[in-house]
């Protein structure tokens, strides 16, 4: 990872951690993520259909960045959400959200990022996802659009 | 630090941590950082010519914020990168990046920040740096422009 | 929390952590926060009159996001600060700050977030607060505006 092999595993319990990067074949919501190649990390957490699946209850720092850009600004409202789903609960819970309106000059080529990060108490079997309002405006470069967490 | 002396060192192994703040005599890339005065932290990590040098392989949360501003907006494309260099590898690896285009109204005084933060698996001897596209547009106040990490 | 009860307390020492969310009855600075309901966390740290009160010296990752929005853009300068106060020191210390100027098109409905996050060495009895320049432009939804920290 990051251009060199992972360090040998230590004897102590593995850190629960994930860092997933943008995957350009996302076609619908939630966003899908690269979980294998490049600067990706996935340890003690599972990745399933766009979601990070918690397998140990506890406190986690969860973060995501999304890079929006377009050829010709028309100021479509942009939103970027990290939300949680659990089969025991009927509704998605929005944990963090960023919104942008009136952020560029009409007609111009434009680019802007949204960053979210905070601590949450997560329970085993919680599924975490990222949602955006305008998929066609997302650039999926691994350094620009990502989703991760680690257990405190 | 933060206006009061550091706490007495604990017996247990020191936490690997850094928080460096903007240094206005940066003249070229990568950005240089204040590593001594103010709200700076540097423990178990070395600072060398703009870079944070990892001396223990492991998982790190790495972050940076850059505050861009100008007297008269001309919408120059802005970029803010955290990248990694290691003598074993020929090329810099961009870990995180933020880009901005069409972000202010021509002619106006303007100000905007870029924030990056994520988890990476770093190896001893990795050097981490911050790069920006327009040095003259960066304000280096310690509360506004910074670069840090800590070992999980 | 996050739609399900907290896990049973473990025997080991409780993690010092806080995640407070926007409270719309903030009337003046510093911002006030929801410390009880919703996705709030408060453990090993006290909340008092808008502030997080540190009760154990050490290294903390501190973060905040503020969601600004308005009906009709007039590009009022926006600022978002995390600052520290301690009775031993005469002056507030600004730890992190974000500023925005010329960020929307005059007359349009607009929305924008500011995110801050970094590591600091905090001392017992330090009080941490969040300040914004334009209270009337803040939206206090729990997913949009928040303030938190955790001890490394």
């Amino acid at each position: 990872q990051i251009g060199h092999p992972s360090p040998p595993p230590e004897k102590k319990e593995l850190r629960k951690v994930a860092h997933l990067t943008g995957k350009s074949n996302s076609r619908s919501m939630p966003l899908e993520w690269e979980d294998t190649y490049g600067i990706v990390l996935l340890s003690g957490v599972k990745y399933k259909k766009g979601g990070l699946v918690i397998n140990e209850t506890g406190l986690y720092f969860v973060y995501s960045k999304v890079y929006f850009r377009g050829q010709s600004c028309n100021n479509l409202p942009l939103s970027h959400k990290v939300y949680m789903r659990n089969s025991k609960y009927p509704q998605d819970l929005v944990m963090m959200e960023g919104k942008m309106m009136s952020y560029c000059t009409t007609g111009q080529m434009w680019a802007r990022s949204s960053y979210l990060g905070a601590v949450f108490n997560l329970t085993s079997a919680d599924h975490l996802y990222v949602n955006v309002s305008e998929l066609s405006l997302v650039n999926f470069e691994e350094s620009q659009t990502f989703f991760g967490l680690y257990k405190l | 630090q933060i206006g009061h002396p550091s706490p007495p060192p604990e017996k247990k192994e020191l936490r690997k941590v850094a928080h460096l703040t903007g240094k206005s005599n940066s003249r070229s890339m990568p950005l240089e950082w204040e590593d001594t005065y103010g709200i700076v932290l540097l423990s178990g990590v070395k600072y060398k010519k703009g870079g944070l040098v990892i001396n223990e392989t492991g998982l790190y949360f790495v972050y940076s914020k850059v505050y861009f501003r100008g007297q008269s907006c001309n919408n120059l494309p802005l970029s803010h990168k955290v990248y990694m260099r290691n003598s074993k590898y020929p090329q810099d690896l961009v870990m995180m990046e933020g880009k901005m285009m069409s972000y202010c109204t021509t002619g106006q005084m303007w100000a905007r920040s870029s924030y990056l933060g994520a988890v990476f698996n770093l190896t001893s001897a990795d050097h981490l740096y911050v790069n920006v596209s327009e040095l003259s547009l960066v304000n280096f106040e310690e509360s506004q422009t910074f670069f840090g990490l800590y070992k999980l | 929390q996050i739609g399900h009860p907290s896990p049973p307390p473990e025997k080991k020492e409780l993690r010092k952590v806080a995640h407070l969310t926007g409270k719309s009855n903030s009337r003046s600075m510093p911002l006030e926060w929801e410390d009880t309901y919703g996705i709030v966390l408060l453990s090993g740290v006290k909340y008092k009159k808008g502030g997080l009160v540190i009760n154990e010296t050490g290294l903390y990752f501190v973060y905040s996001k503020v969601y600004f929005r308005g009906q009709s853009c007039n590009n009022l300068p926006l600022s978002h600060k995390v600052y520290m106060r301690n009775s031993k020191y005469p002056q507030d210390l600004v730890m992190m700050e974000g500023k925005m100027m010329s960020y929307c098109t005059t007359g349009q409905m607009w929305a924008r977030s500011s995110y801050l996050g970094a590591v600091f060495n905090l001392t017992s009895a330090d009080h941490l607060y969040v300040n914004v320049s334009e209270l009337s432009l803040v939206n206090f939804e729990e997913s949009q505006t928040f303030f938190g920290l955790y001890k490394l």
Epitope: - | Q71, S72, T106, G107, Q108, N139 | N75
Partner: antibody, heavy 119, light 106 residues
Framework: QVQLVESGGGVVQPGRSLRLSCAAS????????IHWVRQAPGKGLEWVAV????????FYADSVKGRFTISRDNSKNTLYLQMNSLRAEDTAVYYC????????????WGQGTLVTVSS | DIQMTQSPSTLSASVGDRVTITCRAS??????LAWYQQKPGKAPKLLIY???SLESGVPSRFSGSGSGTEFTLTISSLQPDDFATYYC????????FGQGTRLEIK
Amino acid sequence: QVQLVESGGGVVQPGRSLRLSCAASGFTFSTYGIHWVRQAPGKGLEWVAVIWYDGSDKFYADSVKGRFTISRDNSKNTLYLQMNSLRAEDTAVYYCARDRDNWNYFDYWGQGTLVTVSS
Amino acid sequence: DIQMTQSPSTLSASVGDRVTITCRASQSISSWLAWYQQKPGKAPKLLIYQASSLESGVPSRFSGSGSGTEFTLTISSLQPDDFATYYCQQYNSYITFGQGTRLEIK
């Protein structure tokens, strides 16, 4: 009503220093950027420097960069211009002027103070 | 740097005349132009901003037009109080003033 009143001008030798002040009243000083603009005798207007509403950022004309320093004290509603290493070509009437909504044009001006640099 | 060139440098006119002052920018400045009036021994006074917007309190006989590189200030019917020097100023890229146009009594 909005008022800007400059002071501190006078005759000074080349290489010496001078500090100008601009006292503001009639508006919320701490929410406006303020500029210095100068006018050499019988000549046109030349922009000199600006300081942002909170004092966080300052910008200068190339002709004065490194020699002049703009500052403000929002608690005193006062703007300053510290002029060092003065030259004959700095001789001018110096005006402070209020910025209009961060747009780099000027809706209110002071009456000016004359600085003469001469040996 | 953007250069601003005013013409004419001096203009002689009579009360009641319609007068036009021109300001040219060395490159396009969109509509980011202001006009000021200055009387001897006094500070400049803002008349027009954003090329054509009349500042509050300024008589309606003053008007501005133009965009890109060519701008005009027009006084529809000269009054005795209007004899002064007029400056254009661009704020598209930093700040530069024209050299001024002196409007004198014919």
